[in-house]
């Protein structure tokens, strides 16, 4: 039960137990038969951080601007300068004697953790669902476009690097091809017209023509069936081109309701 | 120099509590523990514990478990002594003392080398 | 705990005179033993520690001796400020117990 070393905060010297220097304190002459231990506070510019039996305090840590450090907590005389490193840029060791820029997540990885004054990006592979298609330091990965919700459907897959590429489902490209076919139809249909206005002003045998002027021809509401002797060409199905059969009425293709 | 100064004396209805303060000056506080000692008038010296002035932690003679507690003040170096549920015979002289430790021959001598003047504490209804 | 008995309890001498007192422990305490002497109204003073090594700024007249259960305090020649009273403490086992105590008084 007696003790079997000296007490926590004491230090065995010359068969004493003298008490150790509080943290802030160096240690100016041990304790004797005859007197205390003797410490001294440390100066403006040191630090001693611990109980202790040292006879120099330590100097402060010096925050190099030069090396992107800055300070972060003031000394005192029992803690030691706190250095961090400017916005953009992170320590590179636990002591934080220099700095480096911040790491950027490159296309097909977003930021996990962002980067501070100590510790560096953490990125991560964007996982199935997600993509980034830029180089940052900020960036999370960002979930795909979601077609359903805007009454599209996917026409390109999306990767760890695009996003998603949505295209009209097939009733609304319906909508789209449908008129685009019947603009082209039309188009067709006026070099026709051209067409049969010059082949009319040819002199023919079949059929006589008691004035040399030019005949004026009409046509009824569903075109073009008015001149059976001619075929004429329509854009019917997929707007491929096809020949109209003679003896045939010609029809235009009306989607079907549903 | 060292010295441990101690509270004025206290005069307690039994069944009343008294703490009685040490204040020490002269040496690092934390860096000894410090002793409570009590003397009966015209009696011998009764050991009532210790307590560890860094870390706060007590250690009481069995005869005084559940009564006495002993706390510190590091910030104002002082130690302090509770004792609880007082009765006539707790009247004493209450003493603080420092404990010192010699190294030899390969073992830690303690022993109370500085001692607070004393508090005279009367239990009487 | 450790009973520590001191003799004599009480002691009559003269200046000049040769004193031993002497303390026993009812179990061995190695060299765990010290001295203290305490004067009418003020608090004791380490005289010895490590049952012989003498207390800084303590006359050397006093000196202490002894091990294991039987330990002596001895004044080699009494002087008018030595007349008080003297208490040994083991410091072996807790609780930290004194002896009864020896008086010193003048013849």
């Known amino acids: 039960e007696p003790p079997t070393a000296c007490r926590e905060k004491q230090y065995l010297i010359n068969s004493q137990c003298c008490s150790l220097c509080q943290p802030g304190q160096k240690l100016v002459s041990d304790c004797t038969e005859f007197t205390e231990t003797e410490c001294l506070p440390c100066s403006e510019s040191e630090f001693l951080d611990t109980w202790n039996r040292e006879t120099r305090c330590h100097q402060h840590k010096y925050c190099d601007p030069n090396l992107g450090l800055q300070v972060q907590q003031k000394g005192t005389s029992e803690t030691d300068t706190i250095c961090t490193c400017e916005e953009g840029l992170h320590c590179t060791s636990e002591s934080c004697e220099s700095c480096v820029p911040h790491r950027s997540c490159l296309p097909g990885f977003g930021v996990k953790q962002i980067a501070t004054g100590v510790s560096d990006t953490i990125c991560e592979p964007c996982p199935v669902g997600f993509f980034s298609n830029v180089s940052s330091a900020f960036e999370k990965c960002r979930p795909w476009t979601s077609c359903e919700t805007k009454d599209l459907v996917v026409q390109q897959a999306g990767t760890n690097k695009t996003d998603v590429v949505c295209g009209p489902q097939d009733r609304q490209r319906a909508l789209v091809v449908i008129p685009i076919c019947l603009g082209i139809l039309f188009v067709i249909l006026l070099l026709v017209l051209v067409f049969i206005k010059k082949v009319a002003k040819k002199p023919n045998d079949k059929v006589p023509h008691p004035k040399q002027e030019p005949q004026e021809i009409n046509f009824p509401d569903d075109l073009p069936g008015s001149n059976p002797a001619a075929p004429v060409q329509e854009t019917l199905h997929g707007c491929q081109p096809v020949t109209q059969e003679d003896g045939k009425e010609s029809r235009i293709s009306v989607q079907e309701r549903q | 120099q060292v010295q441990l100064v101690q509270s004025g004396a206290e005069v307690k209805k039994p069944g009343a509590s008294v703490k009685v303060s040490c204040k020490a000056s002269?040496?690092?506080?934390?860096?000894?523990?410090m002793y409570w000692v009590r003397q009966a008038p015209g009696q011998g010296l009764e050991w009532m514990g210790w307590i560890n002035p860094d870390s706060g932690a007590p250690t009481y003679a069995q005869k005084f478990q559940g009564r006495v507690t002993m706390t510190r003040d590091t910030s104002i170096s002082t130690a302090y002594m509770e004792l609880s549920r007082l009765r006539s015979d707790d009247t004493a002289v209450y003493y603080c003392?420092?404990?010192?430790?010699?190294?030899?021959?390969?073992?830690?001598?303690?022993?109370?080398?500085?001692w607070g003047q004393g508090t005279l504490v009367t239990v009487s209804s | 705990d450790i009973q520590l008995t001191q003799s004599p309890s009480f002691l009559s001498a003269s200046v000049g005179d040769r004193v031993t007192i002497t303390c026993r422990a009812s179990?061995?305490?190695?060299?765990?033993l010290a001295w203290y002497q305490q004067k009418p109204g003020k608090a004791p003073k380490l005289l010895i520690y490590?049952?012989?090594t003498l207390q800084s700024g303590v006359p050397s007249r006093f000196s202490g001796s002894g091990s294991g259960t039987e330990f002596t305090l001895t004044i080699s020649s009494l002087q008018p400020e030595d007349f008080a009273t003297y208490y040994c403490q083991q410091l072996w086992s807790y609780p930290w117990t004194f002896g009864q105590g020896t008086k010193v008084e003048i013849k």
């Open positions: 490590a049952a012989s």
């Open positions: 179990q061995g305490i190695s060299s765990y």
């Open positions: 003392a420092r404990e010192k430790i010699y190294y030899g021959s390969g073992n830690y001598y303690p022993s109370f080398d500085y």
């Open positions: 002269g040496y690092t506080f934390a860096g000894y523990y």
